[in-house]
Interface confidence: low
Amino acid sequence: GWVWNQFFVPEEMNTTSHHIGQLRSDLDNGNNSFQYKLLGAGAGSTFIIDERTGDIYAIQKLDREERSLYILRAQVIDIATGRAVEPESEFVIKVSDINDNEPKFLDEPYEAIVPEMSPEGTLVIQVTASDADDPSSGNNARLLYSLLQGQPYFSVEPTTGVIRISSKMDRELQDEYWVIIQAKDMIGQPGALSGTTSVLIKLSDVNDNKPIFKESLYRLTVSESAPTGTSIGTIMAYDNDIGENAEMDYSIEEDDSQTFDIITNHETQEGIVILKKKVDFEHQNHYGIRAKVKNHHVPEQLMKYHTEASTTFIKIQVEDVDEP
C-alpha cells in the first residue's frame, strides 16, 4: 500500500524549492526498480516528484490566499514490467498560512448618522475588516479593533468593530466627527499587521434649543389711519436647531388693549405684528405689548429644554394724522 503523512507547504517560501514530504509504496525496497509519477493540476509546474524516491518538492512560491490546497494523483510503476505497483491514489497538499495580509476594510467609505444627545452605549455603526489570511491558522486573521481618533465621544468593541457612543454630543457645538478605527491581526501580538478606516459620523438634530428673541425691546410705529389687518412691523427670534426643530410660533403674551396680534411667517420664521383694531392718536398715542415665541414641534421627552418661553417687549408709537 501507499505510505505518506499529510502534506503541508508554507506559502511565500523564498527558497527555490521546498521539500514537502515523501510518497512511497511499501513494496519499494529501495533498489530503484520503481518509478513515481505525479499527475493533476500543478504537477510539473508547481510540484515535482523524485521519480526514484517519491520525494515531493514545491518548486514555486505559493500564495495561500490565491489557492489553499492542491489535489494531486500519484502513480508508481514497476520499471521492468511497466505495470502499476499500486492503484493510482489521490492526495492533498495544503498550503499553510503565514501572516502576510493586513486587515482591509472593504465597505469604505463608512458614514453614519446618529441623533445628538444620544446616551452612552448607543450603537452607531459596525465596521468590519477582512483579513485574507487563514482564520484557522493561529491568530493570523484574528482581528482586534481599536479607536485611533474619536475619544472621548466614541468607543469600539474590540472583537466586533461595533462603534458606540461613549459621551453625549451636542450638534450645535459640532455637527460631525471623523473617527479612525484600526484593525490589527494576530490579536494585537508582535508581528501584527494593521489597517485603518475613517468613519464620518454626522449628528442629526434634536430639538434641544428653544427659540430666543434677538432683542429684548422692539420699537414700532403705526399710523392712526392704518386699517385693521395692517402689518406694522416684524420681530425675530433665533433657534440654534435646524429644520423643523427651528420652526417657531409667535404669540401675544400681554396686550391689555387687545389692539394687536402676531402671526408667524413660516417661510422666514419672523413674527409679524398686525393691527387688530384701529388706533386713535387722540385717544392713546402709544402701546406696550409683550410677545412670546415657542417651537412648533417639541417631543415630550425634550420638553425639559423648553420650560420657559422667550419673551420680548414691543413699544408701539401711534403717528398722528391730520383729520379734517
Epitope: 448607543t122 450603537l123 455603526i125 459596525q126 472583537t159 461595533v162
Partner: antibody
C-alpha cells in the same frame, strides 16, 4: 439557502440538564453571530443567549446566567446550548437564529423551527 | 434593561385595511429596532431591521418608521396572510429585549 435545524429538546426533570444543537448550512458560519431565543407556551419571545462569530464574545439573559452555556463549533457549523439546573420556567420552544450584517450584527435574520424543552417532574 | 412596550395588544381589522402597530422603548435605542411576524406553530420571520429597512423578500406593504423611543410598523393594506402576531425587538443594548407582541386578527 440558509437553513437552521435545532435538535436535543425533550422532557427533563427540574435540576436536570439538556444540550441543544443547531445545525447551520448555506452561509459562512464563523462570520456571523448566533442566538438562542425561547418562547414559553402561549407567551412571547424571550432572548436567551448570543455568541459572536468565532466565539470570542458570549452574552446571556439574567434568567439563565450561570446555568446555560452557549458555544459553537465552526468546523461543524453547529451552535450549542448546554442547559443545566433546569427549572419549570425554562419550559419553552427554543429557536436558534442567525445574526445579520453591519449595524445588524447582533440581530436575528433567519430562524430555525425550534425544539421543545419541557421541565417537569 | 430596556423595556419594549407594544400597543395595542390586539388589533381587529378587515382585509384591505391599514394596520398601525406601535412600539415604545423605555429609553432611546436610536434606530436599532427589528420587527418580526409569527404565525401559530411557525418560527418568527424578520420583516424590518434598522427601524425601517425591509428584510429580503418582504412585500412593500410593510413599512417601519421611528427612532429613539417611538416606533411604528405599518401594513398599508392587509392581506389574508398578514393576520399574525407581530413583535418588536431592540438590539441596541444587552440584554436584547422583545415587546410583548400585537395580535392582528380578522374583524
Amino acid at each position: 439557502e440558509v437553513q437552521l435545524l435545532e435538535s436535543g429538546g425533550g422532557l427533563v426533570q427540574p435540576g436536570g440538564s439538556l444540550r441543544l444543537s443547531c445545525a447551520a448550512s448555506g452561509f459562512t458560519f464563523s462570520s456571523y453571530a448566533m442566538n438562542w431565543v425561547r418562547q414559553a407556551p402561549g407567551k412571547g419571545l424571550e432572548w436567551v443567549s448570543t455568541i459572536s462569530g468565532g466565539g470570542a464574545n458570549t452574552y446571556y439573559a439574567e434568567s439563565v446566567k450561570g446555568r446555560f452555556t452557549i458555544s459553537s463549533d465552526n468546523s461543524k457549523s453547529t451552535l450549542y446550548l448546554q442547559m443545566n439546573s433546569l427549572r419549570a420556567e425554562d419550559t419553552a420552544v427554543y429557536h436558534c437564529a442567525k445574526g445579520g450584517m453591519g449595524g445588524y450584527y447582533y440581530g436575528m435574520d433567519v430562524w430555525g423551527q425550534g425544539t421543545t424543552v419541557t421541565v417537569s417532574s | 434593561e430596556i423595556v419594549m412596550t407594544q400597543s395595542p395588544v390586539t388589533l381587529s381589522l378587515s382585509l384591505g385595511e391599514r394596520a398601525t402597530l406601535s412600539c415604545r422603548a423605555s429609553q432611546s435605542i436610536s434606530s436599532n429596532l427589528a420587527w418580526f411576524q409569527q404565525k401559530p406553530g411557525q418560527a418568527p420571520r424578520l420583516l424590518i431591521y434598522g427601524a425601517f429597512t425591509r428584510a429580503t423578500g418582504i412585500p412593500a406593504r410593510f413599512s417601519g418608521s421611528g427612532s429613539g423611543t417611538e416606533f411604528t410598523l405599518t401594513i398599508s393594506s392587509l392581506e389574508p396572510e398578514d393576520f399574525a402576531v407581530y413583535y418588536c425587538q431592540q438590539y441596541n443594548y444587552w440584554p436584547l429585549t422583545f415587546g410583548g407582541g400585537t395580535k392582528v386578527e380578522i374583524k
